[in-house]
Amino acid sequence: MMTGTIETTGNISAEKGGSIILQCHLSSTTAQVTQVNWEQQDQLLAICNADLGWHISPSFKDRVAPGPGLGLTLQSLTVNDTGEYFCIYHTYPDGTYTGRIFLEVLESSVAEHGARFQIP
């Protein structure tokens, strides 16, 4: 029986050009974690494997850094980074646990937001 639960950072927002840490935490299980995958929709961002360590997908190498812990740091954010991110914990004997994070990347400064909503 799968007793574990995944706690995530939930729905988060960050500014364009900035960085954000995506984090998931598996608890309430003694199952052995063998690998953690990070995915954006259907794209693989990174893998942390017990024996092989971290692998960052080549297309994200310049903008993704592993850590802290099993988290993932996304840098130089663009509006295109808005969307769903998934952490997938592969465990034995429980199986797979999945956590979901929604990231919204906002246009940069508060001043810009203010200007956009000025009354003519």
């Epitope: 063998t34 942390c48 017990a50 802290p68 099993l70």
Partner: antibody, heavy 117, light 107 residues
């Protein structure tokens, strides 16, 4: 098997600098964070900082930022910690430790640094 | 920075006893808490990772529990080889930090 090899000891003069090494073997060096930890005689453990050899990314405890430089040589799978402007407060055992899926799962034997005139 | 407070600082026990060591974080670190054992003149050794995950090669008498700010390392039926200092460490945020340690000594 995974090993982190560190020199047993270093003796340096106050005011000088030293470069401590940590040679990794038995795994893909560029895929695991390497951390450095300080332990003064009979005291607790202090996290100094880390480096990801795959990119050179570093993080430091603020306390050590002006004292420490972390580098790697991927061709020899070796991590280095450069300590500058040494004082007696820097006398300690310095460990390198690897972080992967299971946190700090491998440790070096530690280098005992003695700062003395 | 996240401060980890371990208690008690020293624990005097007899082989065969069972003990619980506490580690409290100054803010939530979810499950990003690890336990180490260090014997005199040796490097630390990882016992439990991510609060409750066991490590291959570590005796089953060691177990971990907790989440958020309160964590416990339990050792069932202590053996003489278990005496030493135990440290907790968090990897939730940089800078990583260690607790001050609990010394387990023979009564």
């Amino acid at each position: 098997q995974v090993q982190l090899q560190q020199p047993g000891s270093e003796l340096v003069r106050p005011g000088a600098s030293v470069k401590l090494s940590c040679k990794a073997s038995g795994y893909t060096f560029t895929s695991f964070w390497m951390h450095w930890v300080k332990q003064r005689h009979g005291q607790g453990l202090e996290w100094i900082g880390n480096i990801y050899p795959g990119s050179g990314t570093t993080n430091f405890d603020e306390k050590f930022k002006s004292k420490v430089t972390l580098t790697v040589d991927t061709s020899s799978s070796t991590a280095f910690m450069h300590l500058s402007s040494l004082t007696s407060e820097d006398s300690a055992v310095y460990y390198c430790t690897r972080e992967g899926l299971y946190a700090f799962d491998q440790w070096g034997q530690g280098t005992t640094l003695t700062v003395s005139s | 920075d996240i401060v980890l407070t371990q208690s008690p600082a020293t624990l005097s026990v007899t082989p065969g006893d069972s003990v619980s060591l506490s580690c409290r974080a100054s803010q939530s670190i979810r499950s990003s808490l690890h336990w180490f054992q260090q014997k005199s003149h040796e490097s630390p050794r990882l016992l439990i990772t991510y609060a409750s995950q066991s490590i291959s090669g570590i005796p089953s008498r060691f177990s971990g529990s907790g989440s958020g700010t309160d964590f416990t390392l339990s050792i069932n039926s202590l053996e003489t080889e278990d005496f030493g200092v135990y440290f907790c460490q968090q990897s939730n945020t940089w800078p990583y930090t260690f607790g001050g340690g609990t010394k387990l000594e023979i009564k």
